[in-house]
């Protein structure tokens, strides 16, 4: 399955989008910053198998898609923005759900997949914790903000690499 | 390979105006934000301030607050350090450095090799 | 503003030498703590991050621990190119500030 071109520009839109988002100073918030521990190597790209990347991939997409869905989310950020934002996650996760067919019917996917997706889930749910404890607060939601934009750039950067071993 | 290249030494004279600069290459120059750095002949490190070139948003120390201008040009991915009217006293090294933003990753991890300024009549 | 206070502000050791600085802060800073090495004429380079975290490329002989007010940067085994100048800095907020620095010096 080819991602295409589309895909990749989707994701630099999300993340335009996201950049925009911010509703105040992050200089505010510095001492809020918090170590939710990235599973860095689920982006690694080279240990995998083009199935694994996809799915990890799509993981990825959906728990943001998620996060920013929540009611909490609608009331932390600029509605226009946030719609936007989500319908680009929404066009990723469509692109990303064909070839998750196409590949696994290629390739059995291993255990090894299902330990990158629990990792991707688990940081998701730290990064949720961290929400919570912070009660939602202006400052935990710049924090959050600026660790999905890390995110998501390690995630266009596994999209090339992919694209390159096509 | 990450580097940030700063503009080199100035002599200039006390009331004059100066703006040095400080180049980001080998990474996303929006994903970070720059801080400059003080260092006067024999002496320690101060902070100046700080800037996020993704949207020019700024934070100073109360020390330099109203004596420089911090700004930055993303199209070219450079950072700026000015003086309206220098000093003698701003006689120092100048560094600029980039910190991970709000993100959890290594403060002021890559430095630039500095900016000597001599301001003398 | 949070006041950086290092210990000692110079200090003579031996190359092989077991070494200790102190930084202490005038509020918690949880561990919100860098330090940074510097040589003459040269830009300050980050050995420790967030109290006790090593920079890549570091070697393991340089160690950080400490949280709230007290840190300790350590050098297990002094070596040559070891000698210069080493500063705290807290990154726990604005304004961003420095220890005055302690110089290490060949015995």
């Known amino acids: 399955c080819d991602l295409p071109q589309t895909h990749s520009l989707g994701n630099r839109r999300a993340l335009i989008l996201l950049g925009q988002m911010g509703r105040i100073s992050p200089f505010s918030c510095l001492k809020d910053r918090h170590d939710f521990r990235i599973p860095q190597e689920e982006f690694d790209g080279n240990q995998f198998q083009k199935a694994q990347a996809i799915s990890v991939l799509h993981e990825m997409i959906q728990q943001t898609f998620n996060l920013f869905s929540t009611e909490d989310s609608s009331a932390a950020w600029e509605q226009s923005l946030l719609e936007k934002f989500s319908t680009e996650l929404y066009q990723q996760l469509n692109d990303l759900e064909a070839c998750v067919i196409q590949e696994v019917g290629v390739e059995e996917t291993p255990l090894m997949n299902e330990d990158s997706i629990l990792a991707v889930r688990k940081y998701f749910q730290r990064i949720t914790l961290y929400l919570i404890e912070r009660k939602y607060s202006p400052c935990a939601w710049e924090v959050v903000r600026a660790e999905i934009m890390r995110s998501l750039s390690f995630s266009t950067n596994l999209q090339k690499r992919l694209r390159r071993k096509d | 390979e990450v580097q940030l290249v700063q503009s080199g030494a100035e002599v200039k004279k006390p009331g004059e105006s100066l703006k040095i600069s400080c180049k980001g290459s080998?990474?996303?120059?929006?994903?970070?934000?720059i801080g400059w750095v003080r260092q006067m002949p024999g002496k320690g490190l101060e902070w100046m301030g700080i800037?996020?070139?993704?949207?020019?948003?700024?934070a100073y120390s109360p020390s330099f607050q109203g004596q420089v201008t911090i700004s930055a040009d993303k199209s070219i991915s450079t950072a700026y350090l000015q003086w309206s009217s220098l000093k003698a006293s701003d006689t120092a090294m100048y560094y600029c450095a980039r910190h991970p933003g709000l993100n959890w990753a290594p403060d002021f991890d890559y430095w630039g090799q500095g900016t000597l300024v001599t301001v003398s009549s | 503003d949070i006041q950086m206070t290092q210990s000692p502000s110079s200090l003579s050791a031996s190359v092989g030498d077991r070494v200790t600085i102190t930084c202490r802060a005038s509020q918690s800073i949880d561990r919100a703590l860098n330090w940074y090495q510097q040589k003459p004429g040269k830009a300050p380079k980050l050995l420790i991050y967030?109290?006790?975290s090593l920079q890549s490329g570091v070697p393991s002989r340089f160690s950080g621990s400490g949280s709230g007010t007290d840190f300790t940067l350590t050098i297990s085994s002094l070596q040559p190119e070891d000698f210069a100048t080493y500063y705290c800095q807290q990154s726990f907020d604005f304004p961003l500030t420095f220890g005055q620095g302690t110089k290490v010096e060949i015995k």
């Open positions: 800037i996020d070139p993704s949207d020019s948003d700024t």
């Open positions: 080998g990474y996303s120059f929006t994903s970070y934000w």
């Open positions: 967030f109290a006790s």
